[in-house]
Every structure is written in structure tokens, then in C-alpha cells.
Amino acid sequence: SQPQAVPPYASENQTCRDQEKEYYEPQHRICCSRCPPGTYVSAKCSRIRDTVCATCAENSYNEHWNYLTICQLCRPCDPVMGLEEIAPCTSKRKTQCRCQPGMFCAAWALECTHCELLSDCPPGTEAELKDEVGKGNNHCVPCKAGHFQNTSSPSARCQPHTRCENQGLVEAAPGTAQSDTTCKNPLEPLPPEMSGTMLM
């Protein structure tokens, strides 16, 4: 009748068949079941009985198959650290947090622990788009040809220059990376003191 097919079973090489759902218990020299996510060990295994699991209490969790004798305490997202909640804590998953809008993760230890304000991008540039929002500080890149951005801002995007002809106007001054095209009514000359504005 030895070795048995299901936990607890003898393990001579200190490894278990299913490493995700079983673990080696060295005092008894056996493989035992881990507890599923959302539960913890309420009674340790032995050669005569497998692990006994119990559900995590409210406001606590275990995310993985485990042989922990306690559940982890749910922690709120700390607004002082610039974090906000995107999903609440459950028995199987810790509170999911992210950086608040306009912030990026400045300290990472398995998860983000501290967010800081995104740096401004100066006129003529915009923040390079990232795969994941809040993952890193802004990297400012110049506006591409035909676009402008005229503020110091962490989030402003480069906009296409106005096409005067689409509005029945003519170009008074060309657009730059930092300013839009200036348009004027084709019938009126542009007064010197009105440069940089659009006349209707």
C-alpha cells in the first residue's frame, strides 16, 4: 500500500509530483496538499491526514496555492503615496492599486509603493505614449511635423496645425512646433499689431 497516490504520500527525493498544488513536509518526509487561493492551513498535514484548509476571513487574502498558516491582511491603496484603487481586495487577490492620474510609479517592490507627479513636457514636445499608464516618468519627444504644443504640461498632446484653407482663410504666419498657424481673411491685410492671431 506504499507509496500512496494522493497526498499525503511518501517522498524519498524531497520533491512532489505537482509542485503548484503540493509541497514537501520535512518533519514527516511526505508530500502534502497546498491550500487553494482564498484559503490557509488550519491544520498541518501528517502521515495520517492531509492538510486541512479554511477560508480566509473578511479583509484578508491568499493569492496562490500555499501552505501558510495565516491569510495576508488586505491593505488599502495609500493616497498619500499617490495610489488609487482599481479593484477591491478579495479572499483570492490583494487590493489592486495604480498611480493617480498625472502620476507615475517612482518606487517598485513587486508592486508600486510610491507615485510621483509626472514631469511637464515643455512647449514643442509631448509625452511619449507608454504601454502601461503610470509605469514611468514622462519622456518628452518633439512634436512631429505639422503639429504643435504650446504649454508646459505632463499630459498635453501635440495638435495638428490649423489648415487655414479649410476655414476659407489664408495663412498669415506658418505654424511651428510651439505655435499654431496664424490665419487671416483673404480680403484684409494683417495689421502689424495683430500678428499671431486669427482674423475673422
Partner: antibody
């Protein structure tokens, strides 16, 4: 031939310390879990300590936890039991024993024992 | 802790007698039980392991039976060298616990 020979027993005052040794021979010592078991005068047997084959894991019953420390030196084929804060109730013959390393876990060999007397 | 209740605590018998000693566990120990013989001033000696299996070099007059919580050591025909104290040990769950012992004496 498997042999386990204990030494280090003697008379010690309450609160005192003593270190027992067990010299092993005739088998690959580093392959086996080892135990200390004691027997008070005229009484039954009591498990005292366990150490894993590599020495990484140690286990004790509540009666000696925090006072006794089991250790081993596989290079010297030796098992030890450091006993401190000794009490009169620790008076006993102390045996080292080997646990069979298959799937049945019985104590297949025992030493002859060494006597520890705790008295003022 | 699993309590091991061994009975009788002492027993008088004659050479040639059939003798049985029992151990009752506080819960099912799934045959993780061994039997030991101890003579005065000597170390315990393994007789039976995993409830029913005879250890190497042990005479066939010794046998073990039982399962769950109830286990028995039987000596089919007592020999003079069998007068000793006998202990059961459960090693199914830590802490390992011994029965109180049975002292087998000559009648």
C-alpha cells in the same frame, strides 16, 4: 554493522547544561534522519528531538522546546544534543536512534544510551 | 498529541504460552505503528514495523496485526529470552508517542 554509541551523560545541577554525543558507524550517516529518545527511571520512552539528514530541519516536543538543541556533523558521523536549563524531570537514559529512510519511518537502530542525572 | 494506550501494563506467562499485547491509538494512525522489545539496561530493539511487518532477524513467533486505532503484538509461543518490556510507537503524526509499556514476566 550499524552502530550508535552515546556519550556525555553525567550528574548536573538543576539549571545546568550538558552536551550529549552519538557516534555513528556502519552506514551512510548523512542519508538518515536521526532522533534522541529518553527514558526516565522506571518509566516509558519519550521522543526528545529530531534532525533531518542534512541538518536543515530540527523538531522538538513542547517539553524540551527552547531548552534542547539537536545538531549533527555529517563529516564526523556525529549527532549531538545540547541540553540547557536542565530540570529534575530531565533525568533519564538518553538514546540516539536512526529512522529508516524508506517509506515506513520506524526507528530501526538504537544506541545503548547515556545516563543524565539532574540533581542538586 | 495522539495518545497511545497500551495494555496490559504487566503480564505473567509461562514458556510456550501465546501472549497478546494491545495498543489503542487516540485516532486512526493508518498502520504507522512499530513494536519494540527492551530488556533491562539495554536499548529498545525493533520487532514489527508498519503494524504487521516483521523486522529483519526477528523470530517468526512474533507477529503484528491491526489497523485504524487498534493494534496487537502476538508472541505465539513464549521463549525464555522473550521476557522483557514491550513498547508500541506511533509515528503517523508528530509528536511521536509511545505506549506506556507492557512488562512480560515469568509466571
Amino acid at each position: 554493522e550499524v552502530q550508535l554509541v552515546e556519550s556525555g551523560g553525567g550528574l548536573v545541577k538543576p539549571g545546568g547544561s550538558l552536551r550529549l554525543s552519538c557516534a555513528a558507524s556502519g552506514f551512510t550517516f548523512s542519508d538518515y534522519y536521526m532522533y534522541w529518545v529518553r527514558q526516565a527511571p522506571g518509566k516509558g520512552l519519550e521522543w526528545v528531538a529530531t534532525i533531518s539528514d542534512g541538518g536543515s530541519y530540527t523538531y522538538y516536543p513542547d517539553s524540551v522546546k527552547g531548552r534542547f538543541t539537536i545538531s549533527r556533523d555529517n563529516a564526523k558521523n556525529s549527532l549531538y544534543l545540547q541540553m540547557s536549563s536542565l530540570r529534575a524531570e530531565d533525568t533519564a537514559v538518553y538514546y540516539c536512534a536512526r529512522e529508516e529512510n524508506g517509506n515506513f519511518y520506524y526507528f530501526d537502530y538504537w544506541g545503548q544510551g547515556t545516563t543524565v542525572t539532574v540533581s542538586s | 498529541d495522539i495518545q497511545m494506550t497500551q495494555s496490559p501494563s504487566s503480564l505473567s506467562a509461562s514458556v510456550g504460552d501465546r501472549v497478546t499485547i494491545t495498543c489503542k491509538a487516540g485516532q486512526d494512525i493508518k498502520s504507522y505503528l512499530s513494536w519494540y522489545q527492551q530488556k533491562p539496561g539495554k536499548a529498545p530493539k525493533l520487532l514489527i514495523y508498519y503494524a504487521t511487518r516483521l523486522a529483519d532477524g526477528v523470530p517468526s513467533r512474533f507477529s503484528g496485526s491491526g489497523s485504524g486505532t487498534d493494534y496487537t503484538l502476538t508472541i505465539s509461543s513464549l521463549q525464555p529470552e522473550d521476557f522483557a518490556t514491550y513498547y508500541c510507537l506511533q509515528h503517523g503524526e508528530s509528536p511521536w508517542t509511545f505506549g506506556g509499556g507492557t512488562k512480560l514476566e515469568i509466571k
